[in-house]
């Protein structure tokens, strides 16, 4: 145990007085308990406005989370309530009290208020490993673009302090098993692999153990490779629109492209009563294209002001790069001012046929 750290086990609805500033109090509650933390003003003087923070994020009061200036109550505690709690002065963000809270699976036994006689039964002084931040171990799949870095973390505790080892696809994993090696931080319960490549794909398991038990967590790593492709246009954009005569309309087109894309907005027109030429290519007029001072962001929006009936029709966002072209189209329906608006998606089903 480090100096200034006290380990206690607390029963249901036990109020815990705050430690001296600078100390971190470690507290264990049972599932279903009411976590109650108390932070009296230092020296008994006025405290000023305070804020309660969990894992760096301000706590929002709710039916289950009761926040007061000197006291915090979390009712019906569960695993997700484990974490680092602090009471801070709102203006200066100075930490007045700091608590490390762990909520165990089993409800704490007995109804005594101070909980002091429970320490022998809970296995905190000597006990099997447990995850200290289970709520931050939910991301089981990491999909990482090649050449970036991956960090697996399995923050744990136990007494005696457990050891951590790593497996890849169920087998012992060591630095010599990969080009570029690995970096281990036992104090941070972490494994780092720099500049990942496709051969790094697989299941990575941390095994945390001491003489009282063993726990493990498996993460899956997928390494993504980029193959050159024509621009990708976001699905559903541009969207069909219905507008009243004289109103303003915006069409949006979101373009993803490795190579620098060239974006154009086109309006489909008729020539001699025909929408397509002899070769089947549609007749279009270019409404917007890249200019000297036009940014990609500006090109992703087509604005039509004070629309007329002539503006009704089909509009296309066309994006091209060195590999090829992609396009999405949408329809504009213009209604007389007195008619009620028709839902845009209904209009789409009528006109986009």
């Amino acid at each position: 145990e480090s100096l200034g750290t006290e380990q206690r086990v607390v029963g249901r609805a036990a109020e815990v007085p705050g430690p001296e500033p600078g100390q971190q109090e470690q507290l264990v509650f049972g599932s279903g308990d009411a976590v109650e933390l108390s932070c009296p003003p230092p020296g008994g003087g006025p405290m000023g406005p305070t804020v309660w923070v969990k894992d760096g994020t301000g706590l929002v009061p709710s039916e289950r989370v009761l926040v007061g200036p000197q006291r915090l109550q979390v009712l019906n505690a569960s695993h997700e309530d484990s974490g680092a709690y602090s009471c801070r002065q709102r203006l200066t963000q100075r930490v007045l009290c700091h608590f490390s809270v762990r909520v165990t699976d089993a409800p704490s036994s007995g109804d005594d208020e101070d909980g002091e006689d429970e320490a022998e039964d809970t296995g905190v002084d000597t006990g099997a490993p447990y995850w200290t931040r289970p709520e931050r171990m939910d991301k089981k799949l990491l999909a990482v673009p090649a050449a970036n870095t991956v960090r697996f973390r399995c923050p744990a505790a136990g007494n005696p302090t457990p050891s951590i080892s790593w497996l890849k696809n169920g087998r012992e994993f060591r630095g010599e098993h990969r080009i570029g090696g690995i970096k281990l931080r036992h104090q941070q319960w972490s494994l780092v692999m720099e500049s990942v490549v496709p051969s790094d794909r697989g299941n990575y398991t941390c095994v945390v153990e001491n003489k009282f038990g063993s726990i493990r967590q498996t993460y899956t790593l997928d390494v993504l490779e980029r193959s050159p492709h024509r621009p990708i246009l976001q699905a559903g954009l541009p969207a069909n629109q219905t507008a009243v005569l004289g109103s303003d309309v915006e069409f949006h087109c979101k373009v993803y492209s490795d190579a620098q894309p060239h974006i154009q907005w086109l309006k489909h027109v008729e020539v001699n009563g025909s929408k397509v030429g002899p070769d089947g290519t549609p007749y279009v007029t270019v409404l917007k294209t890249a200019g000297a001072n036009t940014t990609d962001k500006e090109l992703e929006v087509l604005s039509l002001h004070n629309v007329t009936f002539e503006d009704a029709g089909e509009y296309t966002c066309l994006a091209g790069n060195s590999i090829g072209f992609s396009h999405h189209s949408a329809w504009l329906v213009v209604l007389p001012a007195e008619e009620e608006l028709v839902e845009a998606d209904e209009a789409g089903s009528v006109y986009a046929g």
Epitope: G56, P145, N148, V150, P155, L224
Partner: antibody
Framework: EVQLVESGGGLVQPGGSLRLSCAAS????????ISWVRQAPGKGLEWVGR????????NYADSVKGRFTISADTSKNTAYLQMNSLRAEDTAVYYC????????????????????WGQGTLVTVSS | DIQMTQSPSSLSASVGDRVTITCRAS??????LAWYKQKPGKAPKLLIY???FLYSGVPSRFSGSGSGTDFTLTISSLQPEDFATYYC?????????FGQGTKVEIK
Amino acid sequence: EVQLVESGGGLVQPGGSLRLSCAASGFPFTSTGISWVRQAPGKGLEWVGRYWAWDGSTNYADSVKGRFTISADTSKNTAYLQMNSLRAEDTAVYYCARTYGIYDTYDMYTEYVMDYWGQGTLVTVSS
Amino acid sequence: DIQMTQSPSSLSASVGDRVTITCRASQDVDTSLAWYKQKPGKAPKLLIYSASFLYSGVPSRFSGSGSGTDFTLTISSLQPEDFATYYCQQSTGHPQTFGQGTKVEIK
């Protein structure tokens, strides 16, 4: 060998525009990113923005948002910083830096690390 | 924005000295902290990432520690090439922000 070479700096009048280029070589441009960082004469470092090649996303510092645009042509392995409506306070050496992500099981965010830097190009905004 | 405050702003030391620079974040940044070294007229160089991981090719006399809001860069035995300005930088919050720098000068 990883290399980044900036170009396009120079003297420009307030309100003017300038486009900086960052030619990169020696790493897979499409999987990582390019950040721009500037340093005013005698001052510290200020992050300007980042282009993330994997999804084409960009992020900017508030001080340049709406005026500066980062783009890239991955077929040329080159990133660009388009600077419009320039002000005297934009005077600085501009660096581009290869940027990779640290993807962590622990966090929803990605930590971005700038590991290779160009030599810098000086932009002076003055009338 | 997350403010990064380095201390001291400057220090004088001799070759062989152990030097410690601290960096404090205005809010929790977990371990998303990097340290850079910059010589006059040159581009910065990455030393440490994720608070404590030594970047490849960086001498082992450099080490980093800390998490949350308080971080430390230590140079165990100062060498002539280590006289420079050192910056910390967080990247957990948007925008990424740098400390104001610590200049390490020859005593």
